[in-house]
Structure formats: C-alpha cells, structure tokens
C-alpha cells in the first residue's frame, strides 16, 4: 500500500509505485540544513552523505539528556521524505547533510548563514548538477538570512523552505519570506491545512504552494529499519524538494523562474479549505498542492504565469503597494485590490531597469495590494503605452500601436479620489482587440509584448446587475496574462488573477445600494505562444 | 575612512523577542567589499572597542555569499559598529527551529 | 578505492567462540552499516545482520539466537562479528559487506570447527 | 521471512548465447530485487539492484527486469568471464534472503 502522500503528489491516471522510479532524481543534488541524520539508516543509506559542516547553539537547559536517535530524528525524517529508498518522492536523488540545528531542534540564523556559505563554496569547488537546497527551518524575519538566501538562488541553486508551524502570516518569518525561495505549507489528506496543536501551517502572500505535511511516513532514527509519521512544514517542503530533484533530473536546465512556474502549474488547484486560513489571508493564500508533471518532459510548449500579490500598502493617503517579478519573468500585466474598494488604481512603471506594478491608495482607505501577473515568455520586448484621462464621455482608450506588439494586460490609475459612475457603455468596439478601454477620469495602461509566435485574445464577462465577484476563464491552451475590470468605478474593490481565471471583485450590494447601471465586467486577456508549441513539437 | 555620505548604516532584530540572541551580530558589508576589507573591518572593529575597554570575538568572516562578518560583542558597541567603513547593515544573531 | 578487508581464516573447535573483523576503507563509514553474510561449503548465502558505524545499533537475523553478537570501532574503521558457542555447521565463509544494500563485499574469512 | 525460488539451479550454454535466469518471491517485493555473480572461490558481486539498475562498471549484456513477484536476470551474450553462479536476493523485508543460486557452466 502506498502512503498517502506519495499518493497525493502522483498525477491522475498514474500508479505512484509505477511513477516513482528508483532513478528519479538521479542527476540532482539536495542539501539537507537540519539536524544531525542517521544517514546509514536503510531508508536512505548510501543516498545522503553527511558533510562534515557543524554549526548549533548549545542545547537549552542543564538536565537535558542528548539521546543520539532524537538528535537525528527531523533530519533523518526528512531525508527520507525526499529519497528514501521506499517512502521517498525522488528515490535517485543524492543528499548532502549539514548540521544547523541541535537535538533541540533549534539553531541560529549566523549558523545558518554559514552553512549556506558552505554550499555556496562547495559548488565553486566542485560544480556539478542541478541543486536543491531543503531549509525545513524557520526564524523570525531576518534581512540577512533572506538576502543570503537572495545571493544563493541568483547563483543558479533551488532552494525550498517550511513555510514555518505558527499559524501565522509567512512574511513574519525567514527563509519564508525571501521572495527568491519556493515556500511551502502543509496539507492533509483531506487537502485542508495542517492544525499542529493550538498551530499550525504557515499561509499567506509568501506562501508559494502547500504540499503534504501530516502523518507522512518516513525514516525513523529509533532503529535502522524503523519508520515513523511525522507532520509539519518541513515534510511538506520536503515533498516540493524531491519533486523539483525530479523535474531538475529530467529537465536539467531548468531556471529557478521555470521550476517555480512548473511547480506551480502542476499543481491541484482549488482543493484546499480556504476557511481555515483568516479571512483576510484567503485571497493572500495560493491554493495550491504541489504534484509530480504528469510526464517528466513536454512542458515546455507553454506559457506560464503565476500571481505575485505585493506587502499591503497601510492606510496611508499617498500609500502606494509594489509587487515585482522573479528577474527573468516579465510583468505581464498589474491589477489592484483593496478591501474598502479605496484605492486609485494602478500602474505599471520602470523600476531598475524593470517593470513593476504600483498600486495606490485613496484618501480614507485601508490599504491596497498591487497583484502582478509574472509570465515566462522568452525573447519577449515589453513595453507600456499610456493614455491621459480623455474626459470624454467614451472614456479612456489606449491601444498597441507597435507593428506586432500584442495586448497582455490593462491597468488604469486615477489621481481624483472617487470616480464617478460611467454610464456609457464600456465594452470595446469589437474588432479592437488591442486596446484598453477605461473610465474618463483614469489614465490606462496597456502592456503590449512582441514575442516571437505570441498571440492574444480579449475574453469578457458582464453582469448587468451588481454582483460580488464576476469571474472570467481562459480556455484550455490559452494562458491568463491580464485581469482588470470594466469600469473602474468605486464599488469595484479590485482584479486578480487566481490559475487561469480573472475575478473581479465588487463592494456587497446589499450595503452599497448600487443601482443596475453599475454593471460590472470582468476583462480577461487570454494568450499564447506559437513559438513554443512549435518548438516542443519539434523537439519530440 | 567614514560611510559614504547619506548612506546610514542600519540596524536590524527579531520582532520575536524570546527568539533574540543579543551580544551576537551578523554586520553586513556593501556587495563590492572584497575579503581583505571584511578582514580590515572586523579588526578595526575591534581595535577601537579595545581603546573603550570592550572585548570583542570575530567568529567568522563571511565571503562567497555575503561580505561581513559576525562578532561577539556588547551591544554598547552597535553605534560604534555601524559607523565603520562598507558597513551596508547590522543584525542581532536569533534563533531558528526545526518546522 | 572502496574496499573491505577482512581477516585471515580460523579453526575453532565446537564450544568455542570467534571474532572476524572487517576493515572499511575508501568511502565515509557513517554512511553505511556493514551486513554479515554467511556461506556454507557448497550452499547458498545466508545474512546474517547488519551493525551501525555511526552508533552501533545492530539488527539480527533471528536464527543467531544470541550467539553472534556485532561490534563497530569507527576510531579505526573496524566491523567485528562474534559468535560463540560454536557448532559444526557454523562451517562457512563469512562475508562482510557494505550496508543493507551488500553493494562492496569483504574477501570473505573461513571459520572452519571441528573437534 | 520471503522464500526465494531461482530457475533453472544449473544450466549448461555456449560463449554468445542468450541467457535468461528467473527468480520468483513468495510474496510481493515490488522491484526490489537484486542479483549477484559470484566465482569459484570469490565474494560475490552487486550486479543489478532495484531489479533493473546496473551498478557502474557492470557490463551492458547484464540486464534485469520484472516486478511484484516475477524477475529475470539475462546475459545478452554470453562472454567466458560469466561462467558462474547467479543469486538473487529480495531486498524488500528485513531479512533480505537469497535464491538458491542458478549455476551457468560451459557446455
């Protein structure tokens, strides 16, 4: 019988005994930042070799008792949960041990800074594969930890951290918050997030994606063939780490943007309880279980896109929320979203040589959040056309005007506080699929690409009567670059991308007392790339 | 040799306060510093804690990822430290756990 | 280069007890424990248990009955097996190999006991 | 403990034949199999782990295949150094057991 995490992260209509072969990984690298490990247990034995990098505090206490096998059970546990010979994701990966926590389980944010060192060093010395670097640790936010962590994954290494255990905001805690680390909470076998006692798992903006992480059978360091159930959300990043060993084996190559997107876009979507998570976290929270690719080549034909929600902005009048792409993926396209529906749009403005999305706050909001859509679009040249307020009663337009430039996202951005109602019809003239239509007090900006092979469509959804939420889908295929609403009026609290589908948000109707001429229409901006398919199709 | 002028050093601590570990300190270069000025820095460091009576312990000098260093030291000394050349930024050691 | 050395041949007599020792070189003993397998003259191959380097915790194969017992020294890379009381058909090449998965084996020590 | 059944104990071939051993268990241990050669006189040798997976070094004519409770070990062609005996060995439960051997000789 097979466990039912390995189970969980097999893909539909595969067998996970059949899918996970003795191989798997086997080109890869995973260092381990733990505890000390059992590394002869038969589980993992002659798969992780224990370096000799030792860095912990002293152990709290002047009664404690250092009893070898819990010394090493989390490590043990974990390195069995990436390539153990029987309950492993990626059986074939070979593992590298460091010593950064004690037989406490705790350790120092200095130590752990110098084992990454370590790594660092060692791969200077000794290049060899793909990396993956497991941190199943967690600490208060630290500047220095993120940035080494920053330093480490711009030099080309994977790494994957606990989202952290105290049923709290991610961003509150590190690695979990170093935007350059994939980041991971803990689900069940229900796919509901993981209560650990009065806690929990992590969630939250910096969350990537949740994996298995309660009652995950491993290596046990009570006895060299015992096994034991462990839960939190170092099991879970544990999962992530053997898959992306799996991903990288079979697609060596692989950038950290593109393993990231992989990840993402593999994974079940929409399963996970949302009411678990506070109530302003949900929106935050990916809802995401990370899985194996249904066959370990052939993704590489499509366009991927994932949201990136920024920090919130504070209630602050002239409060502004940035939310920023990985390095090599382009801004596709930037929305906004604030709970009171205060906010005076958004936009997409050059920032260090690249774009970002800026949201802005109005007079007597909360806060808003900028909500960029990164996509992985080779070869492409991006740029942003803007077009002032028309104080016209057509409202603003602005179109790519460039000869093969395409549309992939609409922002709009207004300086007066409160924008009326436009009660002109605000669907675009057919026919014009290259252009952003807005209210006429808002400047609107369009993001037009030229990719080789990139085509794109505008896809809208309308609701006479006020409502909610109005959601729009692109087709199997076709890629979600751009979400934004039609108009920009108050009541609209915002657009966001979730997967593949743009859901606009409204105020409750039943406390704004809206009239039926504020409809309100969902634009979504649906692409793809012929250039990729093409070349997929080639390469097989 | 002073901080570049309008660049303030900055010091950084866990908002979680039974996590701290105070008395030990990451202090953070500027990306460009070479070792031998991490090395300089830390000795200077300690040169002028000395002539103030404090005793200070360089336990590693950080390269490859991070240029800096981390010391040993009082906490009486942040002030001092975080006028000294290429520092970027300062942060109270802390501790981390198994998730 | 990965080896196990193991020693010379012994002549026991039945009562009697021995020690084979088994030298690991070439690879990082913590990594692996070191399996026991036994072979009688003309018979297949019988395991016999497993002994950690890294802390000495040993699994056995039921039928030793607690008369083998398996020791590490890491201080000098050394896997020993004992066993007392010996019988006749205790006759055998004793191998030692490299971890559960016998992937590098020892030259094998003959323990031969007759009265 | 898993019984291990090998097939044929003994068979007589030429140099270049094709040669196949097969090893049964007597309950299912998924692929884990290993087979080993061994020599008048020597230990034996790892020669396929996983019930498929050549360790380096081990020449490509060794191949290994199967499943749950059915596994073949098969010499492509035969070369004077094969002459010898061939144990498989589950690797599944503790204790791992060996088949009874199978005895390649020249014919």
């Known amino acids: 019988s097979i466990p039912w995490n390995l189970e969980r992260i097999t893909p539909p209509r595969y067998r996970a005994d059949e899918y996970q072969p003795p191989d798997g990984g086997s080109l890869v690298e995973v260092y381990l930042l733990d505890t000390s490990i059992q590394s002869d247990h038969r589980e993992i034995e002659g798969r992780v070799m224990v370096t000799d990098f030792e860095n912990v505090p002293e152990e709290d206490g002047t009664r404690f008792h250092r009893q070898a096998s819990k010394c090493d059970s989390h490590g043990t546990h974990l390195a069995g949960v990436v390539s153990g010979r029987d309950a492993g994701v990626a059986k074939g990966a070979s593992m590298r041990s460091l010593r950064v926590l004690n037989c406490q389980g705790k350790g120092t944010v200095s130590g752990t800074l110098i084992g990454l060192e370590f790594i660092r060093k060692s791969q200077l010395v000794q290049p060899v594969g793909p990396l993956v670097v497991l941190l199943p640790l967690a600490g208060g936010y630290s500047r220095v930890l993120n940035a080494a962590c920053q330093r480490l994954a711009r030099a080309g290494v994977v790494l994957v951290t606990a989202a952290g255990n105290f049923r709290d905001d991610a961003c509150l805690y590190s690695p979990a918050s170093a935007p350059e680390v994939i980041t991971v909470g803990a689900t069940n076998a229900q796919d509901q997030p993981v209560t650990l006692g009065t806690l929990g798992t992590n969630f939250g903006r910096c969350v990537d994606l949740f994996a298995p992480g309660e009652d995950i059978i491993g290596a046990s360091s009570d006895c060299s063939t015992c096994f034991v159930s462990q839960s939190g959300t170092s099991q879970a990043a544990a999962h992530v780490a053997g898959i992306a060993a799996m991903m990288l084996s079979a697609e060596p190559e692989l950038t950290l943007a593109e393993l990231r997107q992989r990840l993402i876009h593999f994974s079940a979507k929409d399963v996970i309880n949302e009411a678990w998570f506070p109530e302003d976290q949900r929106v935050l929270t990916p809802n995401l279980v990370a899985a194996l690719p249904p066959s370990t080549h052939g993704a590489g034909w499509q366009l991927f896109c994932r949201t990136v929600w920024s920090a919130h902005s504070g209630p602050t009048r002239m409060a502004t929320a940035i939310a920023r792409c990985a390095p090599d993926e382009e801004l596709l396209s930037c929305s906004s979203f604030s709970r009171s529906g205060k906010r005076r749009g958004e936009r997409m403005e050059a920032q260090g040589g690249k774009l970002v999305c800026r949201a802005h706050n109005a007079f007597g909001g909360e806060g808003v959040y900028a909500i960029a859509r990164c996509c992985l679009l080779p070869q492409a040249n991006c740029s942003v056309h803007t077009a002032p307020p028309a104080e016209a009663s057509m409202g603003t337009r602005v179109h790519c005007h460039q000869q093969g430039h395409v549309l992939t996202g609409c922002s709009s951005h207004w300086e007066v506080e409160d924008l009326g109602t436009h009660k002109p019809p605000v669907l675009r003239p057919r026919g014009q699929p290259n252009q952003c239509v807005g209210h006429r007090e808002a400047s609107i900006h369009a993001s037009c690409c030229h990719a080789p092979g990139l085509e794109c469509k505008v896809k809208e959804h309308g609701i006479p009567a006020p409502q909610e939420q109005v959601t729009v889908a692109c087709e199997e295929g076709w890629t979600l670059t751009g979400c934004s609403a039609l108009p920009g009026t108050s009541h609209v609290l915002g657009a966001y991308a979730v997967d593949n589908t743009c859901v606009v948000r409204s105020r409750d109707v039943s406390t704004t007392g809206s009239t039926s001429e504020e409809a309100v229409t969902a634009v979504a901006i649906c692409c793809r790339s012929r250039h990729l398919a093409q070349a997929s199709q080639e390469l097989q | 040799e002073a901080p570049e002028h309008g660049t303030t050093a900055t010091f950084h601590r866990c908002a979680k306060d039974p996590w701290r570990l105070p008395g030990t300190y990451v202090v953070v270069l500027k990306e460009e510093t070479h070792l031998s000025q991490s090395e300089r820095t830390a000795r200077r460091l300690q040169a002028q804690a000395a002539r103030r009576g404090y005793l200070t312990k360089i336990l590693h000098v950080f390269h490859g990822l991070l240029p800096g260093f981390l010391v040993k030291m009082s906490g009486d000394l942040l002030e001092l430290a975080l006028k000294l050349p290429h520092v970027d930024y300062i942060e109270e050691d802390s501790s981390v756990f198994a998730q | 280069q990965v080896q196990l050395v193991q020693s010379g041949a012994e002549v026991k007599k039945p009562g009697a007890s021995v020690k084979v020792s088994c030298k690991a070189s070439g690879y990082a003993i913590y990594n692996y424990g070191i399996s026991w397998v036994r072979q009688a003259p003309g018979q297949g191959l019988e395991w016999m248990g497993w002994?950690?380097?890294?802390?000495?915790?040993?699994n056995y194969a039921q039928k030793l009955q607690g008369r083998g017992t398996m020791t590490t020294d890491p201080s000098t890379s050394t896997a020993y097996m004992e066993l007392r009381s010996l019988r006749s058909d205790d006759t055998a090449v004793y191998y030692c190999a490299r971890g559960y998965v016998m992937d590098i084996w020892g030259q094998g020590t003959t323990v031969t006991v007759s009265s | 403990d898993i019984q291990m059944t090998q097939s044929p104990s003994s068979l007589s071939a030429s140099v270049g034949d094709r040669v196949t051993i097969t090893c049964r268990a007597s309950q299912s241990i998924n692929n884990w199999l290993d087979w080993y050669q061994q020599k008048p006189g020597k230990a034996p040798k790892l020669l396929i782990y996983a019930a498929s997976t050549r360790p380096s070094g081990v020449p490509s004519r060794f191949s290994g295949s199967g499943s749950g409770t059915d596994f073949t070990l098969t010499i492509s062609s035969l070369q004077p150094e094969d002459f010898a005996t061939y144990y498989c060995?589950?690797?599944?439960?503790?204790?791992?057991?060996f088949g009874q051997g199978t005895k390649v000789e020249i014919k």
């Open positions: 060995q589950q690797d599944q439960d503790i204790p791992p057991t």
């Open positions: 002994v950690s380097f890294y802390n000495g915790n040993t």
